[in-house]
Interface confidence: low
């Protein structure tokens, strides 16, 4: 099955790779923007250049294109703990990351939020700590992983998930005692 | 199967209070962090609250922090989201979801439910 192009895509698959379709004659294939420019006029005919401007303080194209208006840049999300890693230039959108020892857990494909790595206490790092996952840990004896920390199994409940890493342990325990009362 | 179930959304006055449950089922309720996250009108998903599996661990945004309080009942399998002083801007379709013990999301979201705030 051949996948279906949008009309835009159509349209530009006609005139070479850089150039694009007239809109208002098909006959003619206009030079596309640079990346950090925007497409003010079509190209008045064939051979002539396409009027291009560039964009404006806080707005950027990324690549070669025949956008009527520059795209908004980002603007970092404090809320999520974000930081700004590169600002915004006409040719680049901002590029916003965390602080040292920091992940970044994604909530959705564009939205992320920065957390603070996980420092294994009572237990040792399995991997560590990288940009989008945060650090795995493998708890001592005694400790089982909860929200990705090392609890102490005095704090494992019979209704939690906790009981089968923790049973090692309570064996033992009762092992100690049954010993005791032979 | 798993499913959520959110309610008592509703229209409510500028400074008003509502408190929105989000019943779960088809899943091991205990296992998971639970999350709530919004939708204002023409706007993108905006996180606003998480809970540790256990409760003992929860999260804000700045918008919300002081004003909304996320808490759940693993004994009925159900999340709540109480919102007090609210503003127009938190006029928004509420949705529950849920995450694993790693913060990384999961792949359930409920249908949501509407908060209007308006005088």
């Known amino acids: 099955l051949v996948p279906h192009l949008g009309d835009r895509e159509k349209r530009d698959s006609v005139c070479p790779q850089g150039k694009y379709i007239h809109p208002q004659n098909n006959s003619i294939c206009c030079t596309k923007c640079h990346k950090g420019t925007y497409l003010y006029n079509d190209c008045p005919g064939p051979g002539q250049d396409t009027d291009c401007r560039e964009c404006e303080s806080g707005s950027f194209t990324a690549s070669e294109n025949h956008l009527r208006h520059c795209l908004s840049c980002s603007k970092c999300r404090k809320e999520m703990g974000q930081v700004e890693i590169s600002s915004c230039t006409v040719d680049r959108d901002t590029v916003c990351g965390c602080r040292k020892n920091q992940y970044r857990h994604y909530w959705s494909e564009n939205l992320f939020q920065c957390f603070n790595c996980s420092l294994c206490l009572n237990g040792t790092v399995h991997l560590s700590c990288q940009e989008k996952q945060n650090t795995v840990c493998t708890c001592h004896a005694g400790f089982f992983l909860r929200e990705n920390e090392c609890v102490s199994c005095s704090n494992c409940k019979k209704s939690l998930e906790c009981t089968k890493l923790c049973l090692p342990q309570i064996e033992n325990v009762k092992g100690t005692e049954d010993s005791g009362t032979t | 199967e798993v499913q959520l179930l959110e309610s008592g959304g509703g229209l409510v006055q500028p400074g008003g209070s509502l408190r929105l449950s989000c019943a779960a089922s088809?899943?091991?309720?205990?296992?998971?962090?639970m999350g709530w996250v919004r939708q204002a009108p023409g706007k993108g998903l905006e996180w606003v609250s998480q809970i540790a599996n256990t409760g003992d661990r929860r999260y804000y945004a700045d918008a919300v922090k002081g004003r909304f309080t996320i808490s759940r009942d693993n004994s009925k399998n159900t999340l709540y989201l109480q919102m007090n002083s609210l503003r127009a801007e938190d006029t928004a379709v509420y949705y529950c979801?849920?995450?694993?013990?790693?913060?990384?999301?999961?792949?359930?979201w409920g249908q949501g439910t509407l908060v209007t705030v308006s005088s």
């Open positions: 979801a849920i995450y694993t013990g790693r913060w990384e999301p999961f792949v359930y």
């Open positions: 088809g899943f091991t309720f205990v296992k998971y962090s």
